[in-house]
Interface confidence: medium
């Protein structure tokens, strides 16, 4: 028996359902009584879901998995994972045994988009050219860790005095805080771009300082 899975990682948004595709080619006369199907975590070998002895043995993994029972006889051994969490990320092995066996692994990449960044300025009044200011760009509830870029009004990168911290919350999602320390020019725009590398999602925030007043 030959097992086939998608070579590309399956990307799933947090809280949505994901399908880990796996198929095999049943021989003529194939019956589900002959099928042993195991989904397991590749690294730890933890059982996720199984079908043996002619019946679905059910989910062994947080009761959030299901097979496609009507499609099994056609060789569709795909696994549905419901309400995806950050902790579900990783490699899953689809193991099919009829008389001989084969297995293949598929990767699940979990993702969550970052919120539109909020910008804060410190100090935020009585600013003059030459003052040192701290601009903070904050974006929330994304996954995986973000890439953060700062640019000036001409779109040129600001690489100097930048400190970025990313903290995971209880759901494993990241809150990003990036701090730029810069000496004010006569006027200028400071932009922050928070990029989700998996979703290729860019979230933009900017602050424009034109003497007085400031716009965000």
């Amino acid at each position: 028996v030959e097992v086939q899975v998608s070579e590309d990682p399956v990307v799933a948004l947090v809280d949505t359902d994901a399908t880990l595709r796996c198929s095999f080619s049943p021989e003529p006369g194939f019956s589900l009584r002959q099928l042993n199907l195991i989904w397991q975590l590749t690294d730890t070998k933890q059982l996720v879901h199984s079908f043996t002895e002619g019946r679905d043995q059910g989910s062994a993994y947080a009761n959030r998995t299901a097979l496609f029972p009507d499609l099994l006889v056609q060789g569709n051994a795909s696994l549905r994972l419901q309400r995806v969490r950050v902790t579900d990320e990783g490699s899953y092995t689809c193991f099919v045994s009829i008389q001989d066996f084969d297995s293949a692994a598929v990767s699940l990449q979990v993702a969550a988009p970052y919120s539109k960044p909020s910008m804060t300025l410190e100090p935020n009044k009585d600013l003059r050219p030459g003052d040192m200011v701290t601009i903070t760009c904050s974006s929330y509830q994304g996954y995986p860790e973000a890439e953060v870029f700062w640019k000036d009004g001409q779109g040129l990168p600001l690489t100097g005095n930048v400190t970025t911290s990313q903290m995971a919350n209880e759901r494993g999602l990241f809150d990003v805080h990036s701090v730029l320390r810069v000496v004010l020019g006569a006027n200028g725009t400071y932009s922050c771009l928070v990029r989700n590398p998996v979703l290729q999602q860019d979230a933009h925030g900017s602050v424009t300082i034109t003497g007085q007043p400031m716009t965000f």
């Epitope: 397991q40 199984s50 043996t52 002895e53 008389q99 001989d100 066996f101």
Partner: antibody, heavy 121, light 107 residues
């Protein structure tokens, strides 16, 4: 390379039980089946049953149903075969065997060294 | 259970001979047949699986053929190391069964 190491030879009285262990190393234990095959002196091979450790499911040959129990301890990568109500015809070498990571639940690339169980009063 | 019948039960042959061992199943088993070699005091060794697939590391003088109910193990040129007992095993069903064995001895 999978290695299967069985417990030592035993002499048992008729009517008693015996439990043979089989410790696996060098490969994946939990996903693949461990079978037990016995061979009486000068006789052929006889399949007794198997366990798939990850599922905790065991299947037995009809002849041994009700008299044999196969279990597995994933934490120690060890499979066990217990045979009860022993009689003299159960005197045999008992092998554990599996297909390793590359073959099958049903054919056996790897075998233990065998455990001789002698049933005698 | 599926019965497996091997013939002959004993075969006398010389080094260099071509040897055929037959295995018959009591019902069709497709190609789900394996062959093993066993030497005295040792565990069996897998030679052929799925009727005709040579197990890794097994010399090419061993070959398997057949499907359905009739199967043959062939040793194209018998070597001194090949004197042993050979067993067929069906795995068409969950319940596995072996043939009674064929002892290949020196003529």
């Amino acid at each position: 390379q999978v290695q299967l190491v069985e417990s030592g030879a035993e002499v048992k009285k008729p009517g008693s039980s015996v439990k043979v262990s089989c410790k696996a190393s060098g490969g994946t234990f939990s996903s693949y089946a461990i079978s037990w095959v016995r061979q009486a002196p000068g006789q052929g091979l006889e399949w007794m049953g198997r366990i798939i450790p990850i599922l905790g499911i065991a299947n037995y040959a009809q002849k041994f149903q009700g008299r044999v129990t196969i279990t597995a301890d994933k934490s120690t990568s060890t499979a066990y075969m217990e045979l009860s109500s022993l009689r003299s015809e159960d005197t045999a070498v008992y092998y554990c065997a599996n297909g390793g990571d590359s073959s099958s639940w049903y054919t056996f690339d790897y075998w233990g060294q065998g455990t001789l169980i002698t049933v005698s009063s | 259970d599926i019965q497996m019948t091997q013939s002959p039960s004993t075969l006398s042959a010389s080094v260099g001979d071509r040897v055929n061992i037959t295995c018959r199943a009591s019902q069709t088993i497709n190609s789900w047949l394996a062959w093993y070699q066993q030497k005295p005091g040792k565990a069996p060794k897998l030679l052929i699986y799925k009727a005709s697939y040579l197990q890794t590391g097994v010399p090419s003088r061993f070959s398997g053929s057949g499907a359905g109910t009739e199967f043959t193990l062939t040793i194209s040129s018998l070597q001194p190391d090949d004197f042993a007992t050979y067993y067929c095993q069906q795995y068409n069903s969950y319940s596995l069964t072996f043939g009674g064995g064929t002892k290949v001895e020196i003529k």
